[in-house]
């Protein structure tokens, strides 16, 4: 037999299918020009020493073969002895290691069998009523096709599906969408209405994320507040990467999960902008304010479940940085200015179990005064910090108040509001004999002591009503008792106590009269 012809003799090997798992498959035959034809196939398994034979049976029942050697592609003309206008059955037999392996048969009319392409170029993926919709441009001059898809997940083998007949310039397919795992899809096409025509090759992989992006599993921590009033938010655990099917590993456009960080600054609610969204890779610096941080995962189908973390406020206080002066017109605060043209946010909140909402005020951008201080003033009528109770004050600063990540903490401290000197006056002053020349003076703690760092000291004044001599005794703010010694029996004394802050001298308590009785010996 000539090599260019189909040989109508018995092939040069025994006729027995080994039934092995390897062997030839995916046989495709089609016309490639007016008078030439091509068949190609795949071979699975070791290729060394394998000889391939393309078998053909005509409708008359006569059969022939082409010897392809080690090649998996073979061309022949319409003069090769194979009928091209009538239906023929073709298959491949591969002779290897003393056994024959057979491909599945294809039955077709060669003249009408056109080589169909798989979907080429961009395959658009969208979600439609809980299913996956794929859409692509029909390859040139190939309108009218049957389309199949196959899909797999990281843990499952290929499953075959049907897209149905297509007859337009664009083709589409509805496929199943997995909720929680990524999928790899491939598509193939063949001529519509041409009985037994060959399937095209499979398309390049189309990688599809799960409907729900994976929930981010992250952990945050926050560093100490630095000298600049900012602290770094750090990510302790990166989000886990999505497991991908084999053909999507490496570069897998379409399956990407993006993680975004949504910052919500809870402190200073009077500022212009409370939230900001950032990429997870770019960890921001924060002020000492309280924040909620949401990590939002999203893929091409939209956002998924988020995870929300709370970053408590940094409550480290600076007891001396804030100077408060109370005048007849109102109250003014002074603190070391940060820089030129800074906007400050002053926030105050009543301290204690009843909590109470934080109130704040935003200053216009201001430069430092000649002493390098920034100021904020308010009138008594405004009612700000007007109640006689303890307030926690925080001052934030920013040169760009519209940018959430550029705020810094200037200071945090406590302040006793209202008329602190009067409100702080100690009550329930009592005097008890201690010895022949001394007494113990006790009092109830001043209201100022509920405000950390505000009460500087108590002062106890003792006045000798005879000589009008006065002595004053400073007492630590944590103490509520002092012993007065060197007193004389039979003399009348008055004792008073006051509570002082760093800025204000307190109001004396009501005078308490006492005397040490003269001891009469028998």
């Amino acid at each position: 037999c000539r090599t260019s012809e189909c040989c109508f003799q018995d092939p040069p090997y025994p006729d027995a299918d080994s039934g092995s798992a390897s062997g030839p498959r995916d046989l495709r035959c089609y016309r490639i020009s007016s008078d030439r034809y091509e068949c190609s196939w795949q071979y699975e398994g070791p290729t060394a020493g394998v000889s391939h034979f393309l078998r053909c049976c005509l409708s008359s029942g006569r059969c022939c073969y082409f010897a392809a050697g080690s090649a998996t592609r073979l061309q022949f003309s319409d003069q090769a002895g194979v009928s091209v206008l009538y239906t023929v059955t073709l298959w491949v037999e591969s002779w290897a290691r003393n056994q024959t392996e057979k491909s599945p048969e294809v039955t077709l009319q060669l003249y009408n069998s056109v080589k169909y392409e798989p979907p080429l170029g961009d395959i658009k993926v969208s979600k439609l009523a809980g299913q996956l919709r794929m859409e692509w441009e029909t390859p040139d001059n190939q309108v009218g096709a049957e389309v199949q898809f196959r899909h797999r997940t990281p843990s499952s083998p290929w499953k075959l599906g049907d897209c149905g007949p297509q007859d337009d310039d664009t083709e589409s397919c509805l496929c199943p969408l997995e909720m929680n795992v990524a999928q790899e899809f491939q598509l193939r096409r063949r001529q519509l209405g041409s009985q037994g025509s060959s399937w095209s090759k499979w398309s390049s992989p189309v990688c599809v994320p799960p409907e729900n992006p994976p929930q981010p599993q992250v952990r945050f921590s926050v560093e100490q507040l630095g000298q600049d009033g900012r602290r770094r938010l750090t990510l302790k655990e990166q989000p886990t990467q999505l497991e991908l099917p084999e053909g999507c590993q490496g570069l897998a456009p379409g399956t990407e999960v993006t993680y975004r960080l949504q910052l919500h600054m809870l402190s200073c609610p009077c500022k212009a902008k409370a939230t900001r969204t950032l990429h997870l890779g770019k960890m921001p610096y924060l002020s000492g304010a309280a924040y909620n941080v949401a990590v939002i995962s999203s893929n091409q189908f939209g956002p998924g479940l988020n995870q929300t973390w709370h970053i408590p406020a940094d409550t480290h206080t600076e007891p001396v940085a804030l100077n408060i002066s109370v005048g007849t017109n109102g109250t003014t605060m002074y603190w070391p200015a940060r820089a030129q043209s800074m906007t400050y946010c002053i926030e105050w909140q009543p301290v204690g179990q009843d909590g109470g909402l934080a109130t704040c005020s935003l200053t216009a951008p201001q430069d430092p005064d000649p002493a390098g201080m920034a100021t904020y003033s308010w009138s008594r009528e405004s009612g700000a910090m007007g109640q006689e109770k303890c307030y926690y004050i925080t001052i934030f600063a920013s040169a760009h108040p519209e940018k959430l990540t550029l705020w810094s903490t200037v200071l945090s401290t406590y302040h006793f509001g209202g008329n602190a000197s009067a409100a702080g006056t100690p009550h329930h002053v009592s005097v008890k004999n201690h010895s022949l020349d001394s007494v113990s003076v006790d009092w109830a703690p001043s209201l100022l002591s509920t405000c950390p760092g505000v009460l500087k000291e108590y002062v106890v004044r003792c006045r000798d009503e005879d000589s009008k001599q006065v002595s004053e005794h400073p007492v630590q703010p944590t103490e509520t008792q002092v012993t007065l010694s060197g007193l004389r029996a039979g003399v009348a004394y008055t004792v008073q106590v006051r509570a002082d802050t760093a800025w204000l001298r307190g109001v004396w308590s009501q005078p308490q009269r006492f005397s040490i009785e003269v001891q009469v010996s028998d």
């Epitope: 945050f220 921590s221 926050v222 809870l266 309280a290 909620n292 995870q307 929300t308 973390w309 709370h310 970053i311 408590p312 409550t315 909140q349 179990q353 909590g355 109470g356 909402l357 934080a358």
Partner: nanobody
């Protein structure tokens, strides 16, 4: 120790409203935040609402935002969950949880909280 007791659950028609309460007792001065979670039969526990004890800032998931409101009465040491426009899928046992201390924590995770109540059952019929 902190003890949490939920109340106010019951049966309600779809579209109706219900208010559940959680009363805290014991070392409540250490409370930093409170939250509500819920668990429907055969499902995982789900975050519903969160409130800071001081200041009252709140967080909700998309599933209840706009329908549920968390609030607190510090003087009574009680946190409330007002549920409006109830749906059959809101049927669950509702638990309140308390957070002490001031460390960084995940708001929507049951494990972040230090104390939990026994739960109150809410059934929404269609």
């Amino acid at each position: 120790e902190v003890q949490l007791v939920e109340s106010g659950g019951g049966l309600v028609q779809a579209g109706g409203s219900l208010r559940v309460a959680c009363a805290a007792s014991g070392r409540t001065f250490s409370t930093y935040a409170m939250a509500w979670f819920r668990q429907a039969p055969g499902k995982e526990r789900e975050f519903v609402a969160h409130i800071l004890w001081s200041g009252g800032s709140t967080v909700y998931p998309d599933s209840v935002r706009g329908r549920f409101t968390i609030s607190r009465d510090n003087a009574k040491n009680t946190v409330y969950l007002q549920m409006n426009s109830l749906k059959p899928e809101d049927t669950a046992v509702y638990y309140c949880a308390q957070k002490s201390g001031r460390q960084v924590y995940r708001i929507d995770s049951w494990d972040s909280f230090d104390y939990w109540g026994q739960g109150t059952s809410v059934t929404v019929s269609s």
